[in-house]
């Protein structure tokens, strides 16, 4: 039997049953998510499940740049630290970059300080890069 | 060494008004979400108001929704609590909490002040 | 709001025994981030409420390893292995996962 692999979006990358979209667009996150979610096909800003995951990711980037933050879609909606992703998957992996307190930052970012592996937290109304993904 | 002490409370009549402070010291308090935490004659705990690090956002029980306002002065180190419509069941020691966290976890209250008393009685 | 029902309300326990204290909340108390903000405080005599265990099973610093905590979805527990005399006074469960967060009623340890 011939399996096909799902077609992504053109423009968009396939990894692993997900199809990944980088915009280089400056949006803050909640502008950057209703764009996501503009796509249709139940795209959002990208979740990051695994380390496997975050590498595929953070090497397809590092091949347009490597200095910008990019959105991805974790956040903590109610101000609690309680963290959680816009797609509904499971906070279970997490790849923060050390502690980040106070400020009022309770939106989630690729950092480019380490190839864009690890996560920071910044303020939501900051205009950065952003990630989108969805399940084709 | 961490320490947050409570203040202000006093008997007050049913229907009036009374402002809780709580100062302070041995963390960076612009870094915590803060509580307030109420014990009631009967030893009942009840989460009445909580603070976000930043001091912009608030959520309480619908038990003071309205009466009761949580602010904090990130400059002094200061947490409030301004209590109005007083009822008797609000009643209880007041407790000052910090919530624990890294910024990207919340790892319980694990800082409590030693309590000031409210009572509520005509 | 999540009512959160603890049992039993007192428990009388020789020195050395093993003490359970049983948490039930009315709806399952894990956030929708997959994390069950499940904590339990130990308030002694005269004193002010303290920490000992948060998201289910982890120990505050400093709490001794004789304490435990367990469960999931609406059914949760609180075991002391070997009870001593410093643990006696009132335990709390605490669910922080829904707002408005809501106590337990409370139960008092008591040294037989």
């Known amino acids: 039997d011939i399996i096909m692999r799902p077609s992504c979006a053109p423009g968009w990358f396939y990894h692993k049953s997900n199809c990944y979209g980088y915009f280089r667009k400056l949006r803050n996150w909640s502008d950057a998510e209703l764009e996501c979610q503009s796509y249709g096909n139940g795209a959002h800003l990208a979740s990051i499940l695994s380390l496997k995951e975050a590498s595929t990711i953070a090497e397809y980037i590092s091949g347009y740049q490597r200095s910008q933050p990019i959105w991805i879609g974790l956040h903590d909606p109610q101000k609690r630290q309680q963290w959680q992703w816009i797609d509904g998957a499971m906070y279970l992996y997490r790849s923060w970059s050390g502690k980040s307190m106070g400020g009022n930052k309770h939106c989630a970012e690729m950092s480019s300080n380490n190839n864009f592996l690890t996560w920071s937290s910044n303020e939501c109304n900051k205009r950065q890069h952003f990630l989108c993904k969805y399940r084709p | 060494e961490v320490k947050v002490v409570a203040s202000g409370g006093i008997l007050v009549q049913p229907g009036g008004s009374l402002k809780l402070s709580c100062i302070v010291s041995?963390?960076?308090?612009?870094?915590?979400?803060m509580s307030w935490v109420r014990q009631n004659p009967e030893k009942r705990l009840e989460w009445v108001a909580e603070?976000?690090?930043?001091?912009?956002?608030?959520h309480y029980p619908d038990t003071v929704k309205g009466r009761f306002i949580v602010s904090r002065d990130n400059d002094n180190n200061i947490l409030y609590l301004q209590m109005n419509s007083l009822k008797s069941e609000d009643t209880a020691m007041y407790y000052c909490?910090?919530?624990?966290?890294?910024?990207?976890?919340?790892?319980?209250?694990?800082?409590w002040g030693q309590g000031t008393s409210v009572t509520v009685s005509s | 709001d999540v009512l959160m029902t603890q049992t039993p309300l007192s428990l009388s326990v020789s020195l050395g025994d093993q003490a359970s204290i049983s948490c039930r909340s009315s709806?399952?108390?894990?956030?929708?981030?997959?994390?069950?903000?499940l904590e339990w405080y130990l308030q002694k005599p005269g004193q002010s409420p303290k920490l000992l265990m948060y998201?289910?099973?982890n120990r505050f610093s400093g709490v001794p390893d004789r304490f435990s905590g367990s469960g999931s979805g609406t059914d949760f527990t609180l075991k002391i292995s070997r009870v001593e005399a410093e643990d006696l006074g009132l335990y709390y469960c605490?669910?922080?996962?829904?707002?408005?967060?809501?106590f337990g009623g409370g139960t008092n340890l008591e040294i037989k």
């Open positions: 909490v910090r919530h624990g966290s890294n910024g990207y976890d919340y790892f319980g209250m694990d800082y």
């Open positions: 041995g963390f960076t308090f612009r870094s915590y979400i």
């Open positions: 603070i976000n690090d930043g001091g912009s956002y608030t």
């Open positions: 709806q399952t108390i894990a956030h929708r981030n997959g994390i069950t903000y």
């Open positions: 998201k289910v099973s």
């Open positions: 605490f669910q922080n996962s829904h707002l408005p967060p809501t």
